[in-house]
């Protein structure tokens, strides 16, 4: 393992590598640790403000975590010759607030990308597709990890955060080969319609620890390869028949529904019936009611139709203050 730990006197990293000299095959950038045997470069917790230009050509796994990158420009990893072996890129916790279109272009082997724990005020629609064409060249990405990328409220753009992320996921249909998508802990209130329709190859989808209230307008129908769907720790109140039927129709899926505030009233009857007969839900015996108060902590699987009633709504003429 070689490492280069230089002081502040080391030459600053260039913003663009277009004019940079090709790196020596075994060169290790300042402030990084390199292992050619493991094909790994780690530039971790070094307060880097830019991606090193002189990354070794052998790099297959690149860790740029815990830095202060702020912005990933177009072609941030473009090199001559290209980093043709780079397969896994971890940029988590690097204070990124802007990822521009084409940021990951010229990485032909990039299979796994982790942008978690960056407060992304701006994620270009073309961050992953690289172009604004209606149909882009397929991205090589197989795993995309976007946990906790929601910016603080004061840094949000006018448009919805959910919409911004969705636009990047569907642009150019570039991510049709994506197998794994993690979107946990992003304060999502809803999942934009048609996003999942553009991701037909998903095997693993993590939407846990968001604020999803309903899945009524979400279609899982075409996710025929889905094996794990994580919906724990959301704000789901009930799953309606359409959603239940779609989940039941997915041949290999397992759904995780723990820690949602299930409302056990008359609208819950179909879901309870479904839970009792389905093998789709993992840990279904742990699901409990949160509302109404009289039902709190009751186990869904133990409920029957007589338990699930709705208070009659008084006609306006009978309502009193």
């Amino acid at each position: 393992t070689s490492s280069a730990s230089s002081s502040s006197s080391s030459a600053p990293f260039l913003a663009s590598a277009a004019s940079a000299q090709p790196p020596l095959p075994d060169q290790c950038p300042a402030l990084c640790e390199c292992s050619e045997a493991a094909r790994t470069v780690k530039c971790v917790n070094r307060n880097l403000t830019e991606v090193p230009t002189d990354l070794p050509l052998y790099v297959r796994n690149l860790f740029l975590t815990g830095n202060q990158l702020a912005v990933l420009p177009a072609g941030a990893f473009a090199r001559r010759p290209p980093l043709a072996e780079l397969a896994a890129l971890n940029l988590s916790g690097s204070r990124l607030d802007e990822v521009r279109g084409g940021a990951f272009e010229h990485l032909p082997s990039l299979r796994q990308l982790d942008l978690s724990h960056n407060p992304l005020a701006y994620l270009s629609p073309f961050a992953f597709s690289g172009s604004n064409a209606s149909i882009s060249a397929p991205s090589p990405l197989v795993e995309l990890i976007l946990n906790h990328i929601v910016p603080p409220d004061d840094k949000r753009q006018n448009r919805s955060f959910e919409g911004m992320v969705a636009a990047a996921l569907v642009a150019g249909r570039a991510l049709q080969g994506l197998h794994l998508l993690e979107l946990a802990s992003n304060h999502f209130l809803y999942l934009p319609r048609d996003v999942l329709a553009q991701l037909p190859s998903l095997r693993y989808l993590d939407l846990s620890n968001n604020s999803l209230v309903s899945l009524t307008y979400v279609s899982f129908r075409n996710l025929t390869h889905l094996e794990s769907l994580h919906l724990e720790d959301n704000a789901l109140k009930v799953l309606h028949n359409g959603t239940l039927a779609e989940l039941q129709g997915l041949p290999h899926v397992r759904v995780f529904l723990d820690n949602n505030p299930w409302v056990c009233d008359c609208h819950m009857a179909d879901m309870v019936t479904w839970l009792k007969q389905t093998g789709v839900v993992q840990g279904k015996d742990r699901l409990t009611c949160a509302f109404p108060e009289k039902m709190r902590n009751r186990v869904l699987l133990e409920l029957n139709s007589a338990d699930l009633d709705c208070d009659p709504i008084l006609p306006p003429s009978l309502q009193t203050s």
Epitope: S201, R203, Y204, T224, E227, S228, H252, R254, Q282
Partner: antibody, heavy 115, light 107 residues
Amino acid sequence: EVQLVQSGAEVKKPGESLKISCKGSGYRFTSYWIGWVRQMPGKGLEWMGIIYPGDSDARYSPSFQGQVTISADKSISTAYLQWSSLKASDTGMYYCARSVLFDYWGQGTLVTVSS
Amino acid sequence: AIQLTQSPSSLSASVGDRVTITCRASQGISSALAWYQQKPGKAPKLLIYDVSNLESGVPSRFSGSGSGTDFTLTISSLQPEDFATYYCQQFNSYPHTFGQGTKLEIK
């Protein structure tokens, strides 16, 4: 990096029992199905069955139902294929593979059953 | 169980040739078909799924087509590393059967 590492080659006599293993790493083992495939010497691939390690739900090919048992221990990220009474016709290479679409494969375990 | 029949069982071709392998299902399997490549002494490798979707990292000279019961794998310009055995597999219903294989040899 996703890896499936299988146990080593086995030489057994007819009637003996055997349990071979497949250890997954580099991914969430409990979140993807794991399948087993047999390849007899000089022959093609045969789908034996799959298991979801998260809840040990297993599906078998009718050709192998009752002949083998597929199991998993999620605490050590390992899937198993076992026989209670081997036959000479069980000789072959056995592969484990991840996901219903077998996107990653183990290196194979050669099982030889001979008296 | 759904049966898959590949043809031809073996095939001789030269580098640069265009090669087509077919797979016929005994009943309709929608688009639930995959193709694998296996080289001697190695584990198989997923090439294509859902009839025509290329697995990440697979060269674009490989392509798949078809629907219902009849499917094809095409290699547009054979490379030396493509000489291997190819299998189709259906995952429309259990058991997820394989075809018997097509051995692609150097002419």
